[in-house]
Amino acid sequence: EEELQVIQPDKSISVAAGESATLHCTVTSLIPVGPIQWFRGAGPGRELIYNQKEGHFPRVTTVSDLTKRNNMDFSIRISNITPADAGTYYCVKFRKGSPDHVEFKSGAGTELSVRAKPSAPVVSGPAARATPQHTVSFTCESHGFSPRDITLKWFKNGNELSDFQTNVDPAGDSVSYSIHSTAKVVLTREDVHSQVICEVAHVTLQGDPLRGTANLSETIRVPPTLEVTQQPVRAENQVNVTCQVRKFYPQRLQLTWLENGNVSRTETASTLTENKDGTYNWMSWLLVNVSAHRDDVKLTCQVEHDGQPAVSKSHDLKVSAHPKEQGSNTAPGPALASAAPL
């Protein structure tokens, strides 16, 4: 009779993480008598996966009933596969011996690779806000996937970006991998409502890529533009001076009125008007009593936006004997009246 052979028909198999892996093994003869054992790897550090005769292997079940006398199928099923289970599995026939069984024949081995889904991509932006026309970097990370092949794309408001660099680690084979990508994005004044999207496609996702997003509202700072104007009011001796603070983001803003360099009033922006592009407008006004001063007065609207250095716009009120003849930029003998924001 021909000598027993151990047949492992599958050179390699691929299994999704969390599923079960079936490792096939048959023998061609019932002789010699002796058990089967399964190992992962070979060499001095090989790992026992299943022993037919003894031991507790909670994740391993046999496909056939090994207690049947004529059984020649020693296939096993390993449940709840993780990337750490990847490797080459050997079905080894032992010959009955005393006191120990003796290794007799080995199968050729089955290489198990594990497919694992990538984690949801996490997109993070810069720690500090940046202003339009500046380039900022966004990072995207996803972990725990296998096999190594993966595709990552960046989008801004649906438009694919091209300025990015991606690394998959480790460089060589591993039980699982991580991807890290950095994209450069040029900010514009219209980006308050914009989104940056990182999209990851992998064989385990069956054509339904994972996405991570970052809102540019958390990254952008749009500095305000200031305009100071005056309009006469019905009372002859009063002028209404307004400071229009336009197109700023985020909302955090403090405004100070100065009269000839001296602080007159400070207020924090509260009731704001939102523009379509997500930026805000605000207006503060002063009623100026023109009868109290003989000299010209410089009025300054000073704005501190989002903790940045203050910006200001000044307006000269010129003293004149004929207040009704003043142009829109001057008024005689100013004095600051009690005024409130709109």
Epitope: G41, P44, R46, E47, G87, Y90, V102, E111, R148, G172
Partner: antibody
Framework: QIQLVQSGPELKKPGETVKISCRAS????????MSWVKQAPGKGLRWMGW????????TCADDFKGRFAFSLETSATTAYLQIHNLTNEDTATYFC????????????????WGQGTLVTVSA | IVMTQSQKFMSTTIRDRVSITCKAS??????VAWYQQKSGQSPKLLIY???NRYTGVPDRFTGSGSGTDFTLTISNMQSEDLADYFC?????????FGSGTKLAIK
Amino acid sequence: QIQLVQSGPELKKPGETVKISCRASGYTFTTYGMSWVKQAPGKGLRWMGWINTYSGVSTCADDFKGRFAFSLETSATTAYLQIHNLTNEDTATYFCARDPHSYGNSPAWFPYWGQGTLVTVSA
Amino acid sequence: IVMTQSQKFMSTTIRDRVSITCKASQNVGISVAWYQQKSGQSPKLLIYSASNRYTGVPDRFTGSGSGTDFTLTISNMQSEDLADYFCQQYSSYPLTFGSGTKLAIK
């Protein structure tokens, strides 16, 4: 196809140091362990030890502890053998040899070998 | 573990059947491989797990044995088979090779 290409022959004086490279291609470098094997002229093969290319951890056979070091440059898919304080007995051909098993935690047999690097130590 | 190849040289003829033996100093199960090495070349794997023929190796090469006694058989000797043959155990550290058997034509 899978290839292991070693650096060229070296002529060294006793007491010097030699560093041999083994550049791997055709497979993913960090999946498979790399062993080093010595063959003195007209002699048999001696396993010197191996390096786990994933973790970078190396194991030296007792006879090769002390003057022998294994290292990696993963980005260049290259393994290195360095021998310090060379003696005449180090004159040999040194082979790198790749393990058959992905994610193996010990070497076994060697399906792939470099072409060998002859190191000659002579005063 | 010492792997002993007692025959340093073996004379053979083309189409002959040749058996090269290797003895382990202790039980190594079937953790044995066989290599062929031609002059000036690196070793080439023939057999692993004592009896499994490696991919692409002609079927005239057969391995057998377990425990301590192992044999590599060439059933139909060819001129290209003239080489040195080494056994190797990988049952325990350090991995060890036999001293080799050189096949030559009678």
